[in-house]
Interface confidence: medium
């Protein structure tokens, strides 16, 4: 059940968001979330994941990119991009959305 907390081994992740209590956190996986709100520059947040693993499944869109990894500090030096609106089924074999 992706909503239940993960009980696997924990990894240390870079934490850079308003919710961080310090420069790193410990979780089941690391996250980077890039969000663009209407009329604003994209905001990138780094942290830890323990709940809602299904968020890692999502395809990047023009508004949000939710990236997950599960090795030591794997979210530290990661830069995400927001993708075009065209679905991947119309772009077989190409990169991105």
């Amino acid at each position: 059940d992706p909503v239940k907390p993960s009980r696997g081994p924990l990894v240390t992740c870079t934490c850079e968001s308003p919710h961080c209590k310090g420069p790193t956190c410990r979780g089941a996986w690391c996250t980077v979330v890039l969000v663009r709100e209407e009329g604003r520059h994209p905001q990138e947040h780094r942290g830890c994941g323990n709940l809602h693993r299904e968020l890692c499944r999502g395809r990047p869109t023009e508004f949000v990119n939710h990236y997950c990894c599960d090795s030591h500090l794997c979210n530290h030096n990661v830069s995400l991009v927001l993708e075009a609106t065209q679905p991947p089924s119309e772009q077989p074999g190409t990169d991105g959305q």
Epitope: W29, V32, Y67, C69, D70, S71, C74, V81, T94, Q97
Partner: nanobody, 120 residues
Framework: QVQLVESGGGLVQPGGSLRLSCAAS????????MGWFRQAPGNEREFVAF???????DYADSVKGRFTISRDNAKKTVTLQMNSLKAEDTAVYYC??????????????WGQGTLVTVSS
Amino acid sequence: QVQLVESGGGLVQPGGSLRLSCAASGSIFRLESMGWFRQAPGNEREFVAFMLSGGTTDYADSVKGRFTISRDNAKKTVTLQMNSLKAEDTAVYYCYVEATTDRIGIKRYWGQGTLVTVSS
């Protein structure tokens, strides 16, 4: 650029098994998430399974207990073992990888797709 080559699709009877493989090549610095989506005719592409580099996995509810994802980081391959196949598993299966090619930028790359048909 990253290239993905899928194999293993085909026609199988209900209750049968298939093993899909996907090999990544190109100027890859690091591979993170690798996984599979599928798209049945007339439907949107839907998530099937993923596996992160450290072994974290997740599956769509419809395939849990029947499908198993695995990966070989050294060979840059991801495999989907599909057992107890049903007619509703018929779809084009697309593998994807989230890869770092330049030590910083992460992008998701897609394969061309391989057709799985479950029919008697």
